[in-house]
């Protein structure tokens, strides 16, 4: 059952110009961890769950083998007794990078390029999306999601990592951007603003939305996140804007109702499994896509960004709960956790639908300025 969504037909955003980034520097969280699959009998997971850098921390993932499923590491190392039938043993090790990406923050020192040189790259995220300049690409088919419907048990880890609130996803959530472009979901997290100040990362014609959800995926071509970092298409993020609507969003309420439990930085709780796809817009066929980066250190490039045209609606109270409950480092509220938009530097944003065509009566023959790069696909 779908929750109320909006903006089903018209391209996202209005013509109004959102406020400029309140952040001096480009700052953002890192795509975080995700768990491993179940061990087969006799092999309970022995995960090395460490922090991996990136858009809210990225976990390590072990590929499916005959007897295990895909594995994904989490933040903190834990070692347990042997023996779980559906939890393949996790022996993969995450190689820590030389730079310490754990010490960064939004809007201040140290400058992100000092934390990770990739943050000064030419093809960074987020970006401002201008539908009129997007290249309509008919080859971009509707996204396919499989296994995103989770029963209440086992429960999922919801964590305040000081940069965002992050939900670690179990193995088996499969996503396809198209034929041969297959991914596994690792985690999801949110970006938001503050009272009266929007906090989405991406913008549409300069308009910033109240908040934004990111679902981070690892390509099935890679066994581990650190192998995929910086590789074209190694990681993919599904992004959707959150807007204010008249009704409570029941899917989001399952997470938002637990935020008080993790108000303190570094705290976590367990939440019942839920329909992860219900956190996304219902229209998987209309979206923008471009190649960018993680929006937090290490800012690795080669990330395929898919930004839904349709938005997700939350009540005003829910948006307030999101932006006004969590605390970050140094006794400061966890707010405005978004990075400034980055220059396209010649990149072309593709659209799966003719976004440049304004359907309003005053539109005369609109011109699509950019052509689809994947036209031959």
């Amino acid at each position: 059952q779908r929750l109320p969504r909006m903006q089903e037909d018209s391209p996202l955003g209005g013509g109004s110009s959102g406020e400029d980034d309140p952040l001096g520097e480009e700052d953002l969280p890192s795509e975080e961890d995700s768990p491993r699959e179940e061990d087969p009998p006799g092999e309970e997971d022995l995960p090395g769950e460490e922090d991996l850098p990136g858009e809210e921390d990225l976990p390590e993932v072990k590929p499916k083998s005959e007897e295990e499923g895909s594995l994904k590491l989490e933040d903190l190392p834990t070692v347990e007794a042997p023996g779980d039938p559906q939890e393949p043993q996790n022996n993969a090790h995450r190689d820590k990078e030389g730079d310490d990406q754990s010490h960064w923050r939004y809007g201040g020192d140290p400058p992100w390029p000092r934390v990770s040189p990739a943050c000064a790259g030419r093809f960074q995220s987020p970006v401002d999306i201008r539908p009129q300049l997007a290249a309509f690409c008919p080859a971009l088919r509707p996204l396919e999601l499989l296994g995103f419907q989770l029963p209440p048990l086992p429960e999922l880890r919801l964590r305040n990592n000081g940069h965002s609130v992050q939900l670690t996803l179990p193995p088996g959530l499969e996503m396809a951007l198209g034929p041969g472009r297959e991914y596994r979901a690792l985690q999801l997290h949110l970006h938001w603003g503050a009272a009266g100040r929007p906090g989405s990362e991406h913008t549409v014609e300069g308009h910033r939305f109240p908040a934004e959800i990111h679902v981070v995926h690892l390509s099935t071509a890679f066994a581990r996140v650190d192998e995929a970092l910086g590789r074209p298409g190694g990681l993919a993020v599904l992004a959707a804007f959150l807007e204010e609507g008249p009704e409570e969003n029941s899917a989001y309420e399952q997470l938002l109702s637990r935020l008080e439990e993790i108000a303190e930085e570094g705290s976590e709780t367990q939440v019942p499994g839920l329909d992860i796809s219900a956190l996304l817009p219902s229209d998987f066929s209309r979206y923008f896509q471009y190649e960018g980066s993680l929006t937090t250190p290490p800012c690795a490039q080669g990330v395929i960004w898919t930004v839904f045209n349709q938005t997700v609606m939350l009540s005003a109270k829910q948006l307030h709960t999101l932006s006004d409950t969590l605390w970050g480092p140094g006794d400061s509220r966890l707010q405005l956790n978004f990075r400034a938009t980055q220059p396209l530097n010649g990149r072309v944003i593709e659209a799966s639908f003719p976004a440049g065509v304004d359907s309003s009566p005053r539109a005369a023959e609109p011109v699509q300025l950019n052509s689809c790069l994947a036209a031959g696909d």
Epitope: P35, D39, A81, D84, L146, P154, E155, P170, P171, G172
Partner: antibody, heavy 119, light 110 residues
């Protein structure tokens, strides 16, 4: 290795009560959700109840809701099923099972304990 | 009447291949919930055979495989052996009924 051992079964009259226990070892008990599944003589498997690792969330089949209570003592690595207002149709072998950390499958099962409800 | 429907029995000769179907509805398998398979040898507790539609726990031979499509799932057993004679159950989650099992399928070797 993972071991689950049920106990507490036996013969009870209709309307009576019984408390089943499941002693767990070989894994970090508090990290895993647990479940009870039963099997009537000569019949198939029927899910009865489940509980989260912390014990904060519990779930029941409609057939036992209001009569059975699942609980756990993580300090004792033990899962419980308190069965009240027992009926003849509750007669079955009761298994405790360990739910996976990332899968809803039941990866390990105990050997079961027989509950007979009869006058 | 089980929420997930399995054939009551299947049979095959040693070395042959058999499949066991598990048919659900839009509130369970069709809604995207994973399917798991269990083997119960006579007089013993069930044992996990396939989890999350297609994955085999360690120790389960490659002769056993699972698949899922739309509102149904299947368990395939190739190279049938005498000790495969058992009851097989599928299990999933149902949005209205919580965890659900199929009625079970008795595999008999000819």
């Amino acid at each position: 290795q993972v071991q689950l051992q049920e106990s507490g079964g036996g013969l009870v009259q209709p309307g009576g009560s019984l408390r089943l226990s499941c002693a767990a070892s070989g894994f970090t008990f508090s990290s895993y959700a647990m479940s009870w599944v039963r099997q009537a003589p000569g019949k198939g498997l029927e899910w009865v109840s489940a509980i989260s690792g912390s014990g904060g969330s519990t779930y029941y089949a409609d057939s036992v809701k209001g009569r059975f209570t699942i609980s756990r003592d993580n300090s004792k690595n033990t899962l419980y099923l308190q069965m009240n207002s027992l009926r003849a149709e509750d007669t079955a072998v009761y298994y405790c099972a360990k739910i996976g950390r990332y899968s809803s499958s039941l990866g390990y099962w105990g050997q079961g304990t027989l509950v007979t409800v009869s006058s | 009447q089980s929420v997930l429907t399995q054939p009551p029995s299947v049979s095959g000769a040693p070395g042959q291949r058999v499949t066991i179907s598990c048919t659900g509805s839009s509130s369970n398998i069709g809604r995207g919930y994973n399917v798991h398979w269990y083997q119960q040898l006579p007089g013993t507790a069930p044992k996990l055979l396939i989890y999350d539609n297609t994955n085999r726990p360690s120790g389960v031979p490659a002769r056993f495989s699972g698949s899922k499509s739309a509102t149904s799932a299947s368990l395939a057993i190739t190279g049938l052996q005498a000790d495969d004679e058992a009851d097989y159950y599928c299990q999933s989650y149902d949005s209205g009924l919580r965890w659900v099992f199929g009625g079970g399928t008795k595999l008999t070797l000819l």
